[in-house]
């Protein structure tokens, strides 16, 4: 029934790596709550999850595009139009190297969400799927945020 039933490990790994707000100890939780900090902790946790979840959702959606009949609603129905929105259409004509340069200069960071731009671009590169596999492996071992920073800071030519 749900798109969420694939790619579980990379999502949960990313969430754990990015979240410094662990509260395994009930007594510590009580103490923090009495100081008025508890409620904001969960809000902060959700803040840290939001961008990463979106990256993972995009990856899952792209992976499931082959199964169009089964997953039609998930990527075809957006209120704004289709899944390929302004971000993807903008990136359509960008070569990977040009895109990274554009992103590093800061325009991409201001105009478009980093996670959308990166996933859209990576999903487009290498028809044989090898780059996608590489990206999946990386995401399995890095928090999404760390991966994004790493990608922005590393020249495409250095990685190929």
């Amino acid at each position: 029934r749900s798109l969420q039933d694939t790619e579980e490990k990379s999502r949960s790994f990313s969430a754990s790596q990015a979240d410094p707000l662990s509260d395994p100890d009930q007594m510590n939780e009580d103490k923090r709550h009495s100081q008025g900090t508890f409620t904001s902790d969960y809000s902060k946790y959700l803040d840290s999850r939001r961008a990463q979840d979106f990256v993972q959702w995009l990856m899952n959606t792209k992976r499931n595009r082959n199964n169009i009949a089964k997953r039609h609603d998930e990527f075809e129905r957006h209120a704004e139009g289709t899944f390929t929105s302004d971000v993807s259409s903008y990136l359509e004509g960008q070569a990977a190297k040009e895109f990274i340069a554009w992103l590093v200069k800061g325009r991409g960071r201001r105009d478009f969400p980093e996670e959308v731009a990166i996933v859209e671009e990576l999903g487009r590169r290498h028809a044989d799927g090898s780059f996608s596999d590489e990206m999946n492996t990386i995401l399995d071992n890095l928090a999404a945020r760390d991966f994004i920073n790493w990608l922005i800071q590393t020249k495409i030519t250095d990685r190929k």
Partner: antibody
Framework: QVQLVESGGGVVQPGRSLRLSCAAS????????MHWVRQAPVKGLEWVAF????????YYTDSVKGRFTISRDNSKNTLYLQMNSLTAEDTAIYYC????????????WGQGTLVTVSS | DIVMTQSPDSLAVSLGERATINCKSS????????????LAWYQQKPRQPPNLLIY???IRESGVPDRFSGSGSGTDFTLTISSLQAEDVAFYYC????????FGQGTKLEIK
Amino acid sequence: QVQLVESGGGVVQPGRSLRLSCAASGFTFSSYGMHWVRQAPVKGLEWVAFISFDGSNKYYTDSVKGRFTISRDNSKNTLYLQMNSLTAEDTAIYYCAKESILAALFDYWGQGTLVTVSS
Amino acid sequence: DIVMTQSPDSLAVSLGERATINCKSSQSVLYSSNNKNYLAWYQQKPRQPPNLLIYWASIRESGVPDRFSGSGSGTDFTLTISSLQAEDVAFYYCQQFYSIPTFGQGTKLEIK
């Protein structure tokens, strides 16, 4: 298919304790955050508690803080809610809910177990 | 916490007609980084748990009939059932998942 089955509900006196369980199947339990959500006639649906996939993060709604403890046993695919110092306001149907890939979004729910706190 | 307010509390619509339920949040649930509204709709039938219909304000969960649609942004949202079927009789709840999750009080949908 995904299944969540709660148990442990019942009638209990104010001040007493109860432990709810939720047996999960049909998905990789150890990869998902889990929640308890309750539904009382007066209050409607109310989020109660969350535990991350590995149990390292636990959060609670203010009204149960210090009284309820959420936990999980990934080896048994089971979620728990230990409820202490129960009051009449805790009377509700308690649902366990699986978090989707998006935080705090509930894509699967159990059938619920009724907890009645009454003297 | 973000307060969710639904209207109306109850609604009676003829079979085949359009049903519209509104939901208002006390603060915006739009995440500017991805332009998504963190708003979900659930359906709850008698003696059953809630069932996820729509998330991100407008995306239908898999298996949900296309007569269900969601719209809105920021603080004002709408769930629309384009042609009411008998099996749609239920309570409907909105929920924000932008922050600590909170639900609307529910709307009871009946057949006129």
